[in-house]
């Protein structure tokens, strides 16, 4: 007999999600309004295009990138969309409350939508580590906690460490990775006998995951430059990100072949490593002065990513119960750290060159920021993991992990797959 959506979740999910949506609508009604000031339409369209790029990255890029499981591809794509839609709404409100609220109502601009989309992207990166082991009701909790934690982290970093939008948002890679890994650590790990095939990848879903990787690859320059302050910084960020991801693709494919005894190319390595350069240059993409430096970083990031994809999944699978094809968690944790370290190295080089106390002070601040991001990610991730383990959410049984049929109606399937 085909698996049915558990009765209790059927009662719990619509009630939980629709009540939450109603609450969000009320919050928007009482506390928000649109920015009504005069602006020319050309400028609005240009500003919207950046937001559109980010939405494509989130919905198609990350949606499809996580869809490589043989029996969990539908859920991966649709649950991603659900989380994105919910996350953007909550992120707009939260950012408004944290930054504008004392002055009255929250003003919604295209920039605030852009910011909210990037905050929601954090959840889509994290969820890769737990997708297939949780239901939608649990994902709603994860969205709310993670967006709230990231919003507060950004506000704290902005106020204490005096950083701008770009710098405090670029902690997203490290934050999302460690948040996802700590949530995964809390969830039931072992796959019961007979279900191991479900977390294997299949050709068509793997192709759609590659499609997701391509969308991310194309739009990563938009992501890295979206929050920068001036055209000159944005242009530099776009160029450097493009060079870095271009080199990381070449490195990923060559490195993947090199890592295999028969010289074969691994799909999982490529999905992962094509993005490596973009993540690694994220924090300092606007600061890198010449293409060759961005390319070197792309090369290093590609090698680290392939190396990580070869040696880390075994460890992640044993300790955290993360399937081999869920590469984003460990990939972003390594590459996000690399990106942060590159930025700190730039500041250290400044200190050595200038002997300026101001710059030495900034090195300490940057190390403090990174440490805080990791600590808050781990703590909020563990809290989320503990919340998701509560019986109230009726989590799928381990035997039903990585199974679309638990959640979806397939009229043409009378019995299992």
């Amino acid at each position: 007999m085909s698996s049915k959506y558990p009765r209790s979740v059927r009662r719990c999910l619509p009630l939980w999600a629709l009540t939450l949506e109603a609450a969000l609508i009320l919050l928007f009604y009482f506390f928000t309004h649109y920015d009504a000031s005069l602006e020319d339409q050309k400028g609005l369209v240009a500003s919207y295009q950046v937001g559109q790029d980010l939405t494509v990255m989130a919905a198609i890029g990350l949606g499809f990138l996580t869809s490589s499981f043989r029996r969990h591809s539908w859920s991966s794509v649709a649950f991603n969309l659900f989380m994105l839609a919910l996350g953007v709404q909550w992120a707009i409100l939260l950012d408004g409350f944290l930054s504008q609220f004392p002055s009255g109502k929250v003003v919604i601009t295209l920039f605030s939508i852009r910011l909210a989309t990037m905050s929601a992207l954090s959840v889509l990166i994290s969820v890769d580590a737990v997708l297939g082991k949780v239901n939608l009701a649990q994902l709603v909790v994860m969205v709310l906690v993670e967006v709230t934690a990231l919003g507060n982290l950004r506000m704290v970093i902005s106020n204490i460490f005096n950083t701008d939008y770009h710098m405090n948002m670029m902690h997203i890679y490290v934050f999302a990775a460690y948040f996802g890994l700590s949530v995964a650590w809390c969830l039931p790990k072992p796959l019961p006998e007979g279900t191991e095939d479900k977390d294997q990848t299949a050709t068509i879903p793997s192709l759609s995951a590659m499609l997701g990787a391509l969308f991310l690859w194309m739009f990563w320059p938009s992501f890295n430059s979206a929050l920068l302050r001036s055209p000159i910084e944005r242009k530099n960020a776009v160029f450097n990100t493009y060079y870095a991801v271009a080199v990381s693709v070449v490195t990923a494919i060559s490195g993947s072949s090199l890592a295999h005894p028969q010289g074969k190319i691994s799909k999982t390595y490529v999905h992962s490593a094509v993005l490596a350069g973009g993540v690694a240059v994220g924090t300092s993409c606007h600061l890198i002065p010449s293409p060759w430096l961005a390319m070197v970083l792309g090369l290093v990031a590609g090698l680290i990513s392939v190396g990580g994809a070869k040696y880390l999944p075994g460890c992640c699978n044993r300790v955290l119960g993360i399937p081999h094809s869920s590469i984003m968690g460990y990939n972003f944790s390594l590459l996000g750290l690399l990106g942060e370290i590159i930025y700190i190295v730039l500041l250290v080089l400044d200190t050595v060159g200038a002997g300026n106390g101001m710059i030495g002070f900034q090195v300490l601040l940057s190390i403090g920021e990174l440490s805080l991001a990791i600590v808050i990610a781990l703590m909020s991730g563990l809290l989320t993991g503990l919340l998701l383990n509560l019986k109230i959410w009726k989590a799928p049984h381990e035997a039903k992990y990585f199974d679309d049929q638990v959640f979806w109606k397939f009229p043409h399937l009378a019995v299992g797959f």
């Epitope: 601009t109 302050r229 055209p231």
Partner: antibody, heavy 129, light 108 residues
Framework: EVQLVETGGGVVQPGRSLRLSCAAS????????MHWVRQAPGKGLEWVAV????????YYADSVKGRFTISRDNSKNTLYLQMNSLRAEDTAVYYC??????????????????????WGKGTTVTVSS | SSELTQDPAVSVTLGQTVRITCQGD??????ASWYQQKPGQAPILVIY???IRPSGIPDRFSGSTSGNTASLTITGAQAEDGGDYYC???????????FGDGTRVTVV
């Protein structure tokens, strides 16, 4: 020649509104952030507001937040400052200024600098009953 | 919002060197810009960044930063250097700009 010309100043009663304009010429207006800065009689400069080059973000000094609105029309090369609920302490010469983002580079990184490199001559706003 | 503190007034003999200071927490994070304003005129940018002069500004103007203090030095002051000098910095996190109270420089 790079030029900024402010208009719209005048005498207004407390609580009333006024709209200042700043016409830009001689440069690509849509590529620059823009500021309003004011100077009360016999006092120093006070930053009022900034708007990003594409109009996507606006920031205000605490003293004018909720009362003043900065906006721009890139198709008309014009910057605006809508001033509502005016008070006596808003009496000042209002300057619009172009934000220049310049950089210098070492072999390994760029350094960005933000400042106001071009200023208008100013327009006088007097709030008095 | 962060504040920048300047000495109200300094006097300098023609041809001598004068140093104007500006103090504030925001200067730990970003460099100061310096503006010169003469009576009835709009301000003019004279120094920004580590020690960068816009074109048209004489090389007798120089800037430096140490900790939370920025300095503007006029080496060999000329009569036309008299006026009000304002330091300015940008708070990176809030994108708010702040001006110092200004220092009146008199060349005698």
């Amino acid at each position: 020649e790079v030029q900024l010309v402010e208009t719209g100043g005048g005498v207004v009663q407390p609580g009333r509104s006024l709209r200042l304009s700043c016409a830009a010429s001689g440069f690509t207006f849509s590529s620059y952030g823009m500021h309003w800065v004011r100077q009360a009689p016999g006092k120093g400069l006070e930053w009022v507001a900034v708007i990003w080059y594409d109009g996507s973000n606006k920031y205000y000094a605490d003293s004018v937040k909720g009362r003043f609105t900065i906006s721009r029309d890139n198709s008309k090369n014009t910057l605006y400052l809508q001033m509502n609920s005016l008070r006596a302490e808003d009496t000042a010469v209002y300057y619009c200024a172009r934000e220049m983002v310049s950089y210098s580079s070492s072999w390994y990184r760029r350094y960005y600098y933000y400042n106001m490199d071009v200023w208008g001559k100013g327009t006088t706003v007097t709030v008095s009953s | 919002s962060s504040e920048l503190t300047q000495d109200p007034a300094v006097s300098v003999t023609l041809g001598q060197t004068v140093r104007i200071t500006c103090q504030g927490d925001s200067l730990r994070h970003s460099y100061a810009s310096w503006y010169q304003q003469k009576p009835g005129q709009a301000p003019i940018l004279v120094i920004y960044g580590k020690n960068i002069r816009p074109s048209g500004i004489p090389d007798r103007f120089s800037g430096s930063t140490s900790g939370n203090t920025a300095s503007l030095t006029i080496t060999g002051a000329q009569a036309e250097d008299g006026g009000d000098y304002y330091c300015n910095s940008r708070d990176t996190s809030t994108d708010h700009y702040v001006f110092g109270d200004g220092t009146r420089v008199t060349v005698v």
